[in-house]
């Protein structure tokens, strides 16, 4: 058993049918010695008397808010949560496996640049009685500071019969140098509590590996005289690290017909312009990627050909 | 993704082309190592990230873009002394900082070159003959060093009398390649920045 926060305790259980559970001793936070009784949640049934209460915690029915009273007055509370260990592996019931970039990915994180700011998000099908708290650091043995905000519900989607809820959090490394070569990864830890179930999820990454630039901005077409060709131009996104000559991007320019089946013409360039043939009803899209470290491509910025 | 091959303009900063080739070569070598050593811990998540140049060179600090020198988090630089002559310094306006930066890059390349050559000698003794260093990568390191053209003491190749532990050598190769790829990215960024300046 360990303390999650004041008066909230997590009991770790080896979770299998007929498991013996864990013996837990609760102590009433009071100078009083006599006439103390204990109850669980809203029930008035007296579970025991005395300054301490010994209970065998086996299932969720044994978890909850234990309260000690004296003469009708509440003295203190202890909330017991359960953390299930199933065959040596901590349960992951609360969050959905996003399966990207690999199986057992519960937290996904992205950064728009090298400033040390990043966003993480996760999915769940649970809509109520759910709380999250997020901590982060650079490295784990001698951790350096990363400050995270509160997790917020950022999207709701309908997936088949189920509603899916997306939560996200923004974090900022306290003293980040955009040009630094990372040798210690960022660690993100999310505590999730659903009703009386506690779970924790972690992700470990280098900022360089989660970079995903914003799409190029000011995408414009300039028709070339007496030609089907157009000059496409764009700019670096505002959120990208500066100077751009140091944090350079490379670009992919795509000409896509109305039908998804039509052949796509693609050009790769390090410049912020390109000459392409504009077909009728086609659209031109441009996306960006770090020129020197191949992390994710940005989303496409698009303009119609006409 | 292979980086597009740059054809340097005549007036182009002389080292940019070499640094692009270096990054391409080390990225290819790392990819090959990951595939060949699939049963070894060779991914970024599995290895310890060690920097053999730590406390010996200060490339990131010495090569910091002017715009980032206002960022206090970037200025924990270490005192390091370097030789300051070299042929990449194409203009008379080259500052002392730029000379320091390029000599730091040269020292990095020299250190990695020694490590890679020592490692290759061990890998050639492996009866499994599983992996060797790409000669192209070693050649590209050499070319960039020549383009930088710093006169510096030659570091003797490390020789080891004891029987090499091939498992450890291959893991060390992965660690070295990951670190060298990160340094090659920094070198490419620096050359691109200097070229634009």
């Amino acid at each position: 058993i360990w303390e999650l926060k004041k008066d909230v305790y997590v009991v770790e259980l080896d979770w299998y049918p007929d498991a013996p559970g864990e013996m837990v001793v609760l102590t009433c936070d009071t100078p009083e010695e006599d006439g103390i009784t204990w109850t669980l949640d809203q029930s008035s049934e007296v579970l025991g008397s005395g300054k301490t209460l010994t209970i065998q915690v086996k299932e969720f029915g044994d978890a909850g808010q234990y309260t000690c009273h004296k003469g009708g007055e509440v003295l203190s509370h202890s909330l017991l949560l359960l953390h299930k260990k199933e065959d040596g592996i901590w349960s992951t019931d609360i969050l959905k496996d996003q399966k990207e970039p690999k199986n057992k990915t519960f937290l996904r994180c992205e950064a728009k640049n090298y400033s040390g700011r990043f966003t993480c998000w996760w999915l769940t099908t649970i809509s109520t009685d759910l709380t999250f708290s997020v901590k982060s650091s650079r490295g784990s043995s001698d951790p350096q500071g990363v400050t995270c905000g509160a997790a917020t519900l950022s999207a709701e989607r309908v997936r088949g019969d189920n509603k899916e809820y997306e939560y996200s959090v923004e974090c900022q490394e306290d003293s980040a140098c955009p040009a630094a070569e990372e040798s210690l990864p960022i660690e993100v830890m999310v505590d999730a509590v659903h009703k009386l179930k506690y779970e924790n999820y972690t992700s470990s990454f280098f900022i360089r590996d989660i970079i995903k630039p914003d799409p190029p901005k000011n995408l414009q077409l300039k028709p070339l005289k007496n030609s089907r060709q157009v000059e496409v131009s764009w700019e670096y996104p505002d959120t990208w690290s500066t100077p751009h000559s140091y944090f350079s991007l490379t670009f992919c320019v795509q000409v896509q017909g109305k039908s998804k089946r039509e052949k796509k013409d693609r050009v790769f360039t390090d410049k912020t312009s390109a000459t392409v043939i504009c077909r009728k009803n086609a659209s031109i899209s441009v996306r960006a990627q770090d020129r020197y470290y191949s992390s994710s491509w940005s989303e496409w910025a698009s303009v119609p050909c006409s | 993704r292979n980086l597009p091959v740059a054809t340097p303009d005549p007036g182009m900063f002389p080292c940019l082309h070499h640094s692009q080739n270096l990054l391409r070569a080390v990225s290819n070598m790392l990819q090959k190592a990951r595939q060949t050593l699939e049963f070894y811990p060779c991914t970024s998540e599995e290895i310890d990230h060690e920097d053999i140049t730590k406390d010996k060179t200060s490339t990131v600090e010495a090569c910091l873009p002017l715009e980032l020198t206002k960022n206090e988090s970037c200025l924990n630089s270490r005192e390091t002394s370097f030789i300051t002559n070299g042929s990449c310094l194409a203009s008379r306006k080259t500052s002392f900082m730029m000379a320091l930066c390029l000599s730091s890059i040269y020292e990095d390349l020299k250190m990695y070159q020694v490590e890679f050559k020592t490692m290759n000698a061990k890998l050639l003794m492996d009866p499994k003959r599983q992996i060797f260093l790409d000669q192209n990568m070693l050649a590209v390191i050499d070319e960039l060093m020549q383009a930088l053209n710093f006169n510096s003491e030659t570091v003797p190749q490390k020789s080891s009398l004891e029987e090499p532990d091939f498992y450890k050598t291959k893991i060390k190769l992965c660690i070295l390649l990951h670190a060298f790829r990160i340094r090659a990215v920094t070198i490419d960024r620096v050359m691109s920045y200097l070229n634009a300046s």
Partner: antibody, heavy 115, light 112 residues
Framework: QVQLVQSGGGVVQPGRSLRLSCAAS????????MHWVRQAPGKGLEWVAF????????YYADSVKGRFTISRDNSKNTLYLQMKSLRAEDTAVYYC????????WGQGTMVTVSS | SYVLTQPPSVSGTPGQRVTISCSGG????????VKWYQQLPGTAPKLLIY???QRPSGVPDRFSGSKSGTSASLAITGVQAEDEADYYC????????????FGTGTKVTVLG
């Protein structure tokens, strides 16, 4: 005391369907994940499928994906394996088992796919 | 599709020490715990070892398990006639959990 009692096995022709049941007693069935494991005659153990305690997630071996469906009725304390498009290579003893560091197995039920 | 490899058979005379190996990789045994089962002919598997080296109550202490790196082993010290059975190791793969990975199985024969 934990008990898993299996039923539903038998002889079936290739291409036909069969549903296996596993009735649980002696524990809070709705709190635990459950597996199906099979063993072809004279062969080793092969995992078939898993279902979460609440039925929210199901996992299958590639060899049965798209043909077999694992399900559970927590109000009846029963686990099911619906097997469709059966093949000769599905012939095996099928076991249900609880998920956890200590596990409990059903007695097994024989499924023979033969024309 | 077995990724946990066991020797097909091992044998010993009563009282001898018999060991069975179970060889896997970094993503399974290297990252997860190992169980061992005993299966007597015509019966369901019985749990002998969980969490690499833990014995459930009721399992004789002549059975012991260990794990090192990407391999695990089961030892029977002082093998007895009633130990003649098939033995299976089981683990998980970190990418496919909760799918169970079983070893190829080992037939233990007690001679004489």
């Amino acid at each position: 005391q934990v008990q898993l009692v299996q039923s539903g096995g038998g002889v079936v022709q290739p291409g036909r369907s069969l549903r296996l049941s596993c009735a649980a007693s002696g524990f809070t069935f709705s709190s635990y994940g459950m597996h199906w494991v099979r063993q072809a005659p004279g062969k080793g153990l092969e995992w078939v499928a898993f279902i979460r305690y609440d039925g929210s997630n199901k996992y299958y071996a590639d060899s049965v994906k798209g043909r077999f469906t694992i399900s559970r009725d927590n109000s009846k304390n029963t686990l099911y394996l619906q097997m469709k498009s059966l093949r000769a290579e599905d012939t095996a003893v099928y076991y249900c088992k609880t998920h956890g560091s200590h596990d409990n197995w059903g007695q097994g039920t024989m499924v023979t796919v033969s024309s | 599709s077995y990724v946990l490899t066991q020797p097909p058979s091992v044998s010993g005379t009563p009282g001898q020490r018999v060991t069975i190996s179970c060889s896997g990789g970094r993503s399974n045994i290297g990252s997860n715990t190992v169980k061992w089962y005993q299966q007597l002919p015509g019966t369901a598997p019985k749990l002998l070892i969980y969490m690499n080296d833990q014995r459930p109550s009721g399992v004789p202490d002549r059975f012991s398990g260990s794990k090192s790196g990407t391999s695990a082993s089961l030892a029977i010290t002082g093998v007895q006639a009633e130990d003649e059975a098939d033995y299976y190791c089981q683990s998980y793969d970190r990418g496919t959990h909760p799918a169970l990975l079983f070893g190829t199985g080992t037939k233990v024969t007690v001679l004489g």
